[in-house]
């Protein structure tokens, strides 16, 4: 595969997955009730990072918001915490690698910082699928905690209303924005190594400068009448460089290993 | 104005069935759902079951499954129940009431009787 | 199914009189998702179809006076007129809309004195 094509498509991939993080951390079916093994009920239940609704046989849907943060369960603060992380990271993965993007040219940015940019976000992007993959892994978690612990507490007759009635205990199971969060954190996961891949592609290696050595008659001077910069496409480098002292080469793709992330 | 306009009374034979109607006016009769409830004379109220006109979802009472059916007509907004192998335990007047906020009933219509005689 | 036990069965009352109709149920009928009562409240006049009163367990229907009041939680439901007018007299049901199937309570009859 090309490197444009592995950029272009590790750029690709990492957008989807981002925009399914996002949609993930937005959605409100991060736990939804259990419906298996229980009474049915004429209200579903589901719940979200930021809001939690009822759903009525009726149809009418009614979503509180959590409107306290002292009041929340750490773990679920935690997630919500991870989620907006891999979102800030994945927003800036974005933007860098649009600048990074081999079939974007912008001013006289060359390989060397691209393949910087191309890493940066590529890394940015690793982070933020692992974010949401822990975010949405250690929400689960905790549902299959509480719903072991609320399916040994079924109808005791402590079941939250006291006495010795019959209570119906909400057990609460996967929703859907889980398996979205799961699947999108992975692909800008694979989006971000494939961007890493593709800087890899764009790197140079500069213990081969190859050029063209002309012998002008008279002198036995080596000059490199100026070469162009291979892959920018932006002006040309005129300047005559003396040859190496390893007889006639030919200049291919001129560049210098990124020696820091320099990018704005 | 909600209204619910039941058919008119039935006598019917024993073994026989009936189907009466409620036709819907003053709302978007796909957006509710309508229930189905039996009241037989000088007695309580019995829920039979509801059907959702926008996808002809429906939810019965176990008693009534097997002896009431229940479909909608969304082009003339009207919904349907049709009661089967009658005895004289059917006789009642049955009410279509539209399902509410909080899963309250907050419209009904006038009731159909029915009178199971041979 | 879940059983809806209405008392008194019949209530004799005078006008203006205090009243109030007691609803127990089976099983808990509160909701942990939204902490509401998944309980209703209808009355019903002689060749009449039901009137939604109370949903919720205490959410007043719009166009009900607001005599009426629904309280209670759980398993223990009441229904309070707290000044009873002629027109008040009729059988009031309750209902659990929470688990299906849906059921009524037998109803309590308010009779004037």
């Known amino acids: 595969m090309s490197v444009t094509a592995c950029q272009g498509l590790g750029f690709v991939v990492s957008l989807i997955g981002f925009a399914g993080i996002i949609a993930a951390t937005c959605m409100d079916q991060w736990s939804t009730q259990d419906l298996y093994n229980n009474p049915v009920t004429a209200v579903f239940n589901y719940q979200g990072l930021w809001r939690s609704c009822v759903r009525e046989s009726s149809g009418f849907t009614e979503c509180r918001g959590y409107f306290t943060l002292l009041g929340l369960p750490a773990m679920l603060q935690a997630v919500r915490a991870l989620m907006i992380v891999g979102i800030v990271l994945g927003v800036i993965g974005i933007l860098v690698s649009i600048f990074a993007l081999k079939c974007i040219r912008i001013g006289s940015m060359d390989d060397s910082a691209k393949a910087k940019m191309t890493l940066t976000s590529g890394i940015l992007f690793i982070i933020s699928g692992i974010c949401a993959i822990i975010g949405v892994s250690v929400f689960a978690n905790m549902l299959v905690t509480n719903f072991w612990m609320s399916t040994a507490n079924m109808y005791s007759g402590m079941g939250g209303m006291g006495g010795m009635v019959q209570t119906v205990q909400t057990r609460y199971t996967f929703g859907a924005a889980l398996f979205v969060g799961w699947v999108a954190g992975g692909l800008t996961l694979i989006g971000g190594v494939m961007m890493c891949i593709a800087c890899r592609g764009l790197t140079p290696d500069d213990s081969n400068f190859k050029a063209v050595s002309y012998h002008a008659s008279g002198q036995n001077v080596a000059y490199r009448p100026g070469g162009f910069k291979a892959s920018t496409g932006f002006g040309s480098n005129t300047r005559n460089k003396k040859i190496y002292d390893g007889g006639a080469r030919t200049e291919d793709d001129e560049q210098s290993h990124p020696t820091k992330y320099d990018y704005v | 104005e909600v209204q619910l306009q039941q058919s008119g009374p039935e006598l019917v034979k024993p073994g026989a069935s009936v189907k009466m109607s409620c036709k819907a006016s003053?709302?978007?009769?796909?957006?509710?759902?309508m229930n189905w409830v039996k009241q037989k004379p000088g007695q309580g109220l019995e829920w039979i079951g509801y059907?959702?006109?926008?996808?002809?979802?429906?939810k019965y009472n176990e008693r009534f499954k097997g002896k009431a059916t229940l479909t909608s007509d969304k082009s003339s907004s009207t919904a349907f129940m049709e009661v089967s192998s009658l005895t004289s335990e059917d006789s009642a007047v049955y009410y279509c009431?539209?399902?509410?906020?909080?899963?309250?009933?907050?419209?009904w219509g006038q009731g159909t009787s029915v009178t199971v005689s041979s | 199914d879940i059983v809806m036990t209405q008392s008194p069965s019949s209530l004799t009352v005078t006008v203006r009189e205090k009243v109030t109709l007691s609803c127990k149920s089976s099983?808990?009928?509160?909701?942990?998702?939204?902490?509401?009562?998944?309980l209703t409240w209808y009355q019903q006049k002689p060749g009449q179809p039901p009137k939604l009163l109370i949903y919720?367990?205490?959410t007043r229907e719009s166009g009900v006076p607001d005599r009426f009041t629904g309280s209670g939680s759980g398993t223990d439901f009441t229904l309070t007129i707290s000044s009873v007018q002629a027109e008040d007299l009729a059988v009031y049901y309750c209902?659990?809309?929470?688990?299906?199937?849906?059921?009524f309570g037998a109803g309590t009859k308010l009779e004037l004195k």
């Open positions: 009431a539209r399902l509410y906020r909080g899963n309250a009933m907050d419209y």
């Open positions: 003053g709302y978007t009769f796909t957006n509710y759902v």
């Open positions: 059907i959702n006109p926008y996808n002809d979802g429906t």
């Open positions: 099983q808990s009928l509160l909701n942990s998702g939204n902490q509401k009562n998944y």
């Open positions: 919720w367990a205490s």
């Open positions: 209902q659990n809309v929470y688990i299906y199937p849906f059921t």
